[in-house]
Structures are given as C-alpha cells and as structure tokens.
C-alpha cells in the first residue's frame, strides 16, 4: 500500500505590504516508530527550489541555512510533533509574492516533498490604515492618553516607527511625538484641527497614516452680546461685561445677538427682569428682536448659556428714553451709560 | 529497499540514437534526484546530469547538452537518458544513480548498461 | 576541475593510505555546505559512495574511512588498509554545476 502523505493548507493567502499573516497548517506522514525516534524536520521552501540544495524560508532544522530575506519573518508556529506546518509570516514584502511547498523529513525512511498543495502568497500594497484610539469627547485642559496601532502588524521583522504631527501638540517634545503614545492636554482652540498618526516600518518604504478631527469639549467662553440698531446706519453695540445700561430712544428697534464659543453648542436663553422671553421672540441661535420699543419695554436683559461643562449668564440694561424730538442726540457717556441713540 | 534498475544499450549504429531507461524503486519517485555517469572503458567517471522529478527540474553538463536528453515517466518510475547522434565517442557504460536528502551525495547506484557503437 | 593524486597507490594490507584532491575553486555552495564525496569503485561494479559532505561516512562504512579539507584542499584516509578496501577511489564536488569527479586513485598491493 502506498504512504500516506496528507498537507492541510490553503492554496492562497493575501496580505498587505508590511502586515503579518498566519497561515494555518496541518501534515500526515507514514511513521512506525517501535525501533528509533529520529528528529522530526519539517521546511517551507520556495517552489521551483530543490529541497536538497535550497535555503529555506523556514524549518526547525537547526543545522539548515534559512534564506536571510525571510530569517526571522517566517517562522513556523506550533507543535511539529502534533503535526502542525502552519507558518507565520511577518513584515509582508512584495518580493514575498509567490509559491511555496512543504517538506517533511524524518531519519532515512521519511523525506518527502508535498508538491501537490502549494501555497500562494500575494502581498499586496499597503491600504490598510493606523488606528488611533482615545476616550471621547476630548475635555479642554484634561489630559488624555491616545494611542496608534496598526492592524494585521505584528513582532516580525524591524520595528514599526510612530510620527504624530498636528497643531494641538505644538507644545510637545519631538521625543514623545515619536511614540505609539502620547498624552495630550487639549485647549479650546485645539477643537476642529487635525491630528494625524504616520506608521512607518524601520528600513522599509512603507508608510502609512490616519488622520482625525478633534472633537474637544470645552466650557463657554468669550460671551458676548451684540445690540444691533436698526437706524439705517447699521450700528452694533458689543457688550462683554454685566451691567452696563444702554440708553435708547422710544420707538427705536433692536436687534440682541448672544453669542458665545463653545463645544459642545450651548444652550442660549433670554430673560428680561429675571423672567423668560417668549420663544417666539427668541431664535435658535440666540437672537432676540425688539421691534418699536416703548417706554416700558426697558430694563434689565439677561442672555443665559447653559452647557454640561458649566453656565453663564450676561446682562445689560435698555433705558427707554422718550422720544422729544426727531432728531438724533447723542450724549456724553456717564457713569457706565452709553450715549442716547435716536 | 531502494533500487535502480537498468536497462537498454547494446550495440547501436552510429548516427542513430538508443534510450537508457533508470527504473526505480523502494522510494517516493519524486524525492530523489537522478543523476546519470558516463564511464568510459578503462577511464574515469563523467557527470551527464540530472534530473528530478519533483519539480521536473533538469540540468546539464554543458559538454552533454546536445547529446543527452533526460526525461522521466511518473507513472512507471522510471528515468531515461536518450544519447542522439552516436559515435565511438559514446561507447560506455552509463550508470543511473540517485540521491536524495541534505547531504548531496549519490548514494543509490544502478549496475550500468553499456553502450557500443559501431557499425 | 578535480586534481586527484596519486595516481596509483601501492600499499601492504595494513598500513594507512592517503589520497589527496584538490578542486581549482571554492566547493562551497552557496548554501554554506561543501558537498565534496569520495566514491570506492571495484572491478565490474558500481561505485560505492563513502564520505559526503567532507567528513561524514555513508551507513555501512567502516571508520577506518575518514575525509577532511575545506575550501579546495581535501584527503581520504585509510587508517588500516584490508583487502577489500582495494579498487579505484574517486573524489566529487556537487556544489557547482558541472558537477566533476577527480581523475581517480587506484589503490593497490605493494
């Protein structure tokens, strides 16, 4: 009867330039072992080599020269003596694009090549993209571990180079920017920029990056309110602290704009003597319109902001002068109080 | 056992060709490599070439390229050497021998056919 | 090209036998080993392979047979020559092709 030789592998496998592939792998050989146990030696060699003169890419035959362009990047993982061929292939190279065929070798009786099931391999180009990870949302002033991998990598071969670049770590030591990690204490202005992740393999020309947006949460800021006066001279008044008192002549209307830096948006609200405006007046983005105001329609105005990081509020005060003349007076500034627009 | 088993040759005519046939046995036909020898009477010992079956791989010595020809027979196991051409030149005994393994070395011979030519 | 000497070797049964061969280039392939084998080829048979690989004796030789040398100097000797020790030895490089073997020694009575 004829020996049973038997190989389980598969007949093709891809894998991107610089990535890592494990192809599994299983034999059979014909084996009666009840007078000596010679080492068992298994290779993968190249096909079209010949096993007794090649160098292979990989054995567990210590006294067999392995090619030096695939030393340490294919390896054979598993327990031969259970019958286990499959082979671990790390660093993926173009020129790695071929076949390859299995070897069994087991003192004078057992030596043979498994020519039938050869496996290919295809690298290919490299498309597959770092990935960057954190804990969102981003919080201005809180520091923040973020990390850079690259999937299907492995140990094999030179070690993957890491380059972070990006104006939110304009502060940081070219040192720490050269990690696979960086801890980054984002500020407000740093909301909307880029960061990216280069993954470069020492010694190769491979490279390959992510880019991200920062998504950074910050508390409001810079809260300001903008009284637009519609006179046909297109004025704004810009008010950026509570208190001020604001003379206006009756009959006059305003435009309130509020308007404040934050991310997420906040909430803005309007109150005038400590009580909500009707929505109606109000729009989504913080507008409030005073059309021909009367003389009791004066007082204290409150732009309130509401956000999850912490809220604010400014005020101002529209003193409602009544109308004498039709022509615009303008008066000197007293005490906190702007000149009377007519 | 592993054994190689030789056949054809005789007295040939020149010009013509004959087919040494290397049969073998007691292995994997693909594992060995086939070498065939030239030994001419009362001379030394002359490397042909070889052939192995395994990735049906042939090489030559340049000195033989036109004059030998290897080709094999999966089926039947067996490896024949055809010599085209004959002269006196040729008249030898051609051995098969087979090696296999990391070592190199030719360590199954057959016994050698002998091949005359004349007219 | 494979320089054997001496040519012919007359010994008494007993005595240690040398036979020299040297190759007009490196023998080692370009896989590291130096495939250099020396064959014993008696009257009216096949030749017999010995040593290969420089030094290793084939299963079933006696280790009277030994084989040393590098790069392109090699010996075989025979430490105690007995009767059937005695035919034509051959030394053989398999590391590039043409694959050559030596112009052969023939070891005989004295």
């Known amino acids: 009867e004829k020996p049973v030789y038997e190989l389980q592998v598969q007949k093709s496998v891809t894998v991107q330039e610089g990535l890592c592939v494990l192809v599994p792998c299983s034999f059979s050989y014909p084996w009666r072992s009840w007078y000596s146990s010679p080492p068992l030696y298994v290779y993968w060699f190249r096909d079209g080599e010949i096993p007794y003169y090649a160098e292979v890419v990989a054995t567990n035959n210590p006294d067999r020269r392995v090619k030096p362009e695939t030393q340490g990047r294919f390896r054979l993982l598993g327990d031969v003596q259970k019958k286990n061929c499959s082979l671990s292939i790390g660093d993926a190279r173009m020129e790695d694009t071929g076949s390859y065929f299995f070897r069994v070798e087991r003192g004078r009786d057992v030596k043979y090549s498994y020519q039938q099931n050869k496996l290919n391999l295809e690298v290919t180009a490299l498309i597959e993209k770092p990935d960057i990870h954190f804990l969102e949302p981003l919080e201005s002033g809180r520091p923040t571990r973020l990390s850079c991998s690259l999937p299907g990598s492995c140990e094999a071969g030179p070690p993957l180079t890491f380059s972070w670049t990006g104006n939110a770590l304009s502060p940081l030591d070219p040192e720490t920017t050269r990690s696979s990690e960086l801890t980054l204490t984002p500020r407000p202005e740093d909301h909307g920029t880029n960061l990216t992740c280069q993954v470069k393999r020492q010694g190769a020309q491979v490279t390959t990056e992510r880019t991200v947006q920062l998504n950074v949460s910050y508390a409001p800021q810079n809260l300001a309110i903008s009284i637009f006066f519609r006179n046909g001279t297109g004025t704004a008044l810009r008010i950026l602290s509570n208190g001020m008192s604001v003379p206006i002549q009756e009959g006059q209307s305003l435009f309130l704009a509020c308007t404040v830096d934050s991310n997420p948006p906040a909430s803005l609200s309007w109150f005038r003597e400590g009580k909500a405006l009707n929505p109606s007046q109000t729009s989504m983005s913080g507008t409030l319109e005073l059309p021909n105001i009367g003389a009791r329609e004066g007082g204290e105005f409150t732009c309130r902001v509401q956000h999850p990081l912490g809220s604010q509020h400014l005020s101002f005060i529209l003193s409602v002068q009544r109308s004498s003349s039709s022509c615009i007076c303008v008066t000197e500034k007293q005490q906190g109080s702007w000149p009377l627009l007519t | 056992q592993v054994q190689l088993q030789q056949s054809g040759g005789g007295l040939v005519k020149p010009g013509t060709s004959v087919k040494l046939s290397c049969k073998a046995s007691?292995?994997?036909?693909?594992?060995?490599?086939i070498h065939w020898v030239k030994q001419r009477s009362g001379q030394g010992l002359e490397w042909i070439g070889w052939?192995?079956?395994?990735?049906?791989?042939?090489k030559y010595n340049e000195k033989f390229k036109d004059k030998a020809t290897l080709t094999a027979d999966k089926s039947s196991s067996t490896v024949y050497m055809e010599l085209s051409r004959l002269t006196s030149e040729d008249s030898a005994v051609y051995f098969c021998a087979g090696h296999e393994g990391y070592d190199g070395a030719m360590d199954y011979w057959g016994q050698g056919t002998s091949v005359t030519v004349s007219s | 090209l494979m320089t054997q000497t001496p040519l012919s070797l007359p010994v008494s049964l007993g005595d240690q036998a040398s036979i020299s061969c040297r190759c007009s280039?490196?023998?080692?392939?370009?896989?590291?080993?130096?495939?250099l084998e020396w064959y014993l080829q008696k009257p009216g048979q096949s030749p017999k392979l010995l040593i290969y690989r420089v030094s290793n004796r084939f299963s079933g030789v006696p280790d009277r047979f030994s084989g040393s040398g590098s790069g392109t100097d090699f010996t075989l000797k025979i430490s105690r020559v007995e009767a059937e020790d005695l035919g034509v030895y051959y030394c053989?490089?398999?590391?590039?092709?043409?694959?050559?073997f030596g112009g052969g020694t023939k070891l005989e009575i004295k």
């Open positions: 052939f192995y079956p395994g990735i049906i791989s042939i």
């Open positions: 280039q490196s023998i080692v392939h370009s896989n590291g080993n130096t495939y």
């Open positions: 053989f490089q398999g590391s590039h092709v043409p694959w050559t």
């Open positions: 007691g292995y994997i036909f693909t594992e060995y490599i």
